[in-house]
Amino acid sequence: ECVTQLLKDTCFEGGDITTVFTPSAKYCQVVCTYHPRCLLFTFTAESPSEDPTRWFTCVLKDSVTETLPRVNRTAAISGYSFKQCSHQISACNKDIYVDLDMKGINYNSSVAKSAQECQERCTDDVHCHFFTYATRQFPSLEHRNICLLKHTQTGTPTRITKLDKVVSGFSLKSCALSNLACIRDIFPNTVFADSNIDSVMAPDAFVCGRICTHHPGCLFFTFFSQEWPKESQRNLCLLKTSESGLPSTRIKKSKALSGFSLQSCRHSIPVFCHSSFYHDTDFLGEELDIVAAKSHEACQKLCTNAVRCQFFTYTPAQASCNEGKGKCYLKLSSNGSPTKILHGRGGISGYTLRLCKMDNECTTKIKPRIVGGTASVRGEWPWQVTLHTTSPTQRHLCGGSIIGNQWILTAAHCFYGVESPKILRVYSGILNQSEIKEDTSFFGVQEIIIHDQYKMAESGYDIALLKLETTVNYTDSQRPICLPSKGDRNVIYTDCWVTGWGYRKLRDKIQNTLQKAKIPLVTNEECQKRYRGHKITHKMICAGYREGGKDACKGDSGGPLSCKHNEVWHLVGITSWGEGCAQRERPGVYTNVVEYVDWILEKTQAV
C-alpha cells in the first residue's frame, strides 16, 4: 500500500537498518526510497525538547510485515518509502536549506557570488554531493561568500548543525542539470586500476555500470566477467573513484570490462532498471519466499509486486511436474545485489522491476519500428502529438512531443497570433487524423510558455512548452521521449527521424497518417553555407539530404527530430524552419533541444 503523507510526532519502533542525516523529513523519505532495503523511516526535526545531536537524524528501517509499531514522540516525523508506490520517483532536490551547515569532507573552497552559483559549481563537479555557502551576512569576514563543496561515502551529510547566515543544498546531478560529460562506452578487456570504494556481484557489465551510477561515491567501475580466470572474482563489480575523477591507469586484461558512472546521463538512459533475464544463472541471497510460477516472466512479476524482493531465480518445472509450474525464489540482500552468482545450474535470474519507476519513463523501450515506407504504424512514435486549433474551425496546427505527464514541447512560432490557450487541443496516441472526431478525448492546454527571447523562427529560440490541464497516463501509444543529456553535446547522432502530419510537397495538404523520414544531421558550418542570409547559431541544428527529397514541411512544425542513441530515443530537435520543403542543398533547421534543457527544466520543475 502506498502511503505518501508524513506522520507528525510519531516514531517507528525498531527495524533500524542505518542512520543518516538529512535536512528534512521529505528528503529522508527520498533517501529511504533509494536505499535497497528501507521501507519506513523516522526523522527527528530540530526541537527544544530534543538533544541537538539527534536533530536531522534519519533512521532507515525495514520490517518483514512492511510496518512497525508507532510511538508518540515530539519532533519525530515518520513515514514510508515510495517503493510501495507506483508513481514516478526522482532524487532531484532543488531545495536550499537556510541556516543549516551540512557536514562532510570539505574538499574544495572558493568564492561564489551566490548560493545558486555555488550549487551550479557543485552540480558540475564530479565529486560533489552537497555544499554549504556562507552568505555575505556571515559574521566571519574571511569566510563570507565562500562556497564549500563536500562529499561523503553515503552521499548524505555526516552531520547537520544549525549555523546562522549559511545555506546548504545538494548537487543537482540527479535533476539532469550537470554539464559533466556523459560517457556511455563500456571498454572491453580493460581494468581500471584505482581505489575500490565498494564491490558487488553483477551478472554483466551493464548492471555493474548502473549500480555504479546510483552509488554516491562511484565514478567508474571494472567488471570481471564469468570467463575471468580467477574464479573467486567472477561476476565481481568493483566500484571505483580517483582524485581526478578519471581512471589513473588502464590495464589491458582479457575478460574484464570497464566503464563510467552514468550520473550525467541518468535522465536519458535507464540506470535503476535491470530488466534483462540471465539464463543458466542463479542469484544467491537471503530467501524471502518460494512461489510456484508458470514462467520466468511471471516470477519477475511476483518479485516486482513483493516490495521487499530485490532479485529472483526461477527454476523451470521438470516435465509435467506441478502443473507445469516452476519454482520462483524471491530474494534480497543488504545492498540489493546477489551475494553470489552461479552458472550452469539451469536457473533463470533477474531483478525486480520496482526500481524502474526511479528511471525516467522516456527510457522505456518502444515496439520495434517498421523500417522503410513513409507511413508510421501505431505506437511507433508514442511521444508525437497533434496540436489542433479550434479557430476558425478545428484543424491540425502543429506537432509536438510529450516530455512529461503534463508537458508538451513544441515550436514557439506555432502560436503566432494565438491569444489564449483555450483554442488549443492536444491529441496523443493518434496515428490517423481521421481518428479525431467530436467525441475523441483530448488534453486542454492550461498555459503556453514561449521562450522569452523568441521573435521569429529564423532568429532562434523557437521553443515553447504547453502545460496540459490534465495529466497523460502513459501507455504503449502515448509516452514521453527523453531530452538529450547536456553531457551528450558531443554525441554524433546517426539514426534520426522527422515525423509529422505535414505536407509531402510544397503545395499539398495535411496528411491523414503520421509520416516519417530518416534524415541525416548536417553540421552547422555546412548548414550556414546553405543559408547565407541567416545566422545559424549553436542553438539550431540542421538535417537534410544534400540532394533534397526528404524533409519536414508545412504542418510538421513543433514536431520532433527524434534520434536513437544507445537504444533510447532522444528529442534532439524541434521542427522550426527551412527554405521551401526538401529542396536541394536547403536542409531543415531545428531548434537544438540540448541547448534548452536548463530552460525546459526550469519551467517544468517550477514549484
Epitope: C414, D556, S576
Partner: antibody, heavy 118, light 111 residues
C-alpha cells in the same frame, strides 16, 4: 484597454529631422515578445513599414530607409520614438504606430499627418 | 524583399454577393506551420484594422462573413454576403520576414 497615439510636428521643411512620439497604454514594453512598429501611408497610397523596436531593445528597419531611421523607447513612460533625418517631400504621409506582439499588428494609433514643404 | 501584388486594384460588388480579393507573394510566406499572411481593412481617416491573421484566422471582433484562405504564395480574402459597411480599402501584409511588407491595396465598393 490598449491604445496608441502618435504625435509629431505636423509640418517641417526638407532636410530637417522628423521626430515622432508614440504614447501607448494598456500594455508594457517590458513584456517579452512585445514590440511597437512605425508604418506610414502617403495620402491616397499604400502602407509602408518603417521600423520596429522589441521589448529587449532589439531593432529592425526597412533596408530602403535604414540609414535615415532611428527608433528608441522609454519603457518607464510607455513611449516609442522615431527619427527620420534629411526629410524630403516624399516623406509626407500619415505616420502610424502599431503594437505587434508574437503575432500580427493588432492595435494601431489614429495616425499623425506629417507634411514636408518648403 | 517579399513583394505582394493585390488584384484587382478596385472592385464593385452588389450587396449580398461575394467579394474576392487576391494577393500574390513574390516568394512563399509559409514556414513549417503558419502562412504569415494577414489582411487589413481601412476606412477613410482611420487606421487599418486587422481582419484575418495567419491566412485564415479571424481577428478579434471580426464578423464571420470575412474569411481568408491560401498558402505559399497565393492568398485570397472573401467577403460574403457583402454589406454596406464593407466599403473600404483592403490590404494584405506578410509577416514572414523583415522588411514586413503590404500589398498595394484593393478598393472595394458597392455596385
Amino acid at each position: 484597454q490598449v491604445t496608441l497615439k502618435e504625435s509629431g510636428p505636423g509640418i517641417l521643411q526638407p532636410s530637417q529631422t522628423l521626430s515622432l512620439t508614440c504614447s501607448f497604454s494598456g500594455f508594457s514594453l517590458n513584456t517579452p515578445g512585445m514590440g511597437v512598429s512605425w508604418i506610414r501611408q502617403p495620402s491616397g497610397k499604400g502602407l509602408e513599414w518603417l521600423a520596429h523596436i522589441y521589448w529587449d531593445d532589439d531593432k529592425r528597419f526597412n533596408p530602403s530607409l535604414k540609414s535615415r531611421l532611428t527608433i528608441s523607447k522609454d519603457t518607464s513612460r510607455d513611449q516609442v520614438f522615431l527619427m527620420i533625418t534629411s526629410v524630403d517631400t516624399a516623406d509626407s504621409a500619415t505616420y502610424f504606430c502599431a503594437r505587434k506582439g508574437r503575432g500580427p499588428f493588432t492595435y494601431w494609433g489614429q495616425g499623425t499627418l506629417v507634411t514636408v514643404s518648403s | 524583399d517579399i513583394v505582394l501584388t493585390q488584384s484587382p486594384a478596385s472592385l464593385a460588388v452588389s450587396l449580398g454577393q461575394r467579394a474576392t480579393i487576391s494577393c500574390r507573394a513574390s516568394e512563399s510566406v509559409d514556414n513549417y506551420a503558419i502562412s504569415f499572411m494577414n489582411w487589413f481593412q481601412q476606412k477613410p481617416g482611420q487606421p487599418p484594422k486587422l481582419l484575418i491573421y495567419a491566412a485564415s484566422n479571424l481577428g478579434s471582433g471580426v464578423p464571420a462573413r470575412f474569411s481568408g484562405s491560401g498558402s505559399g504564395t497565393d492568398f485570397s480574402l472573401n467577403i460574403h454576403p457583402m454589406e454596406e459597411d464593407d466599403t473600404a480599402m483592403y490590404f494584405c501584409q506578410q509577416d514572414k520576414e523583415v522588411p514586413w511588407t503590404f500589398g498595394g491595396g484593393t478598393e472595394l465598393e458597392i455596385k
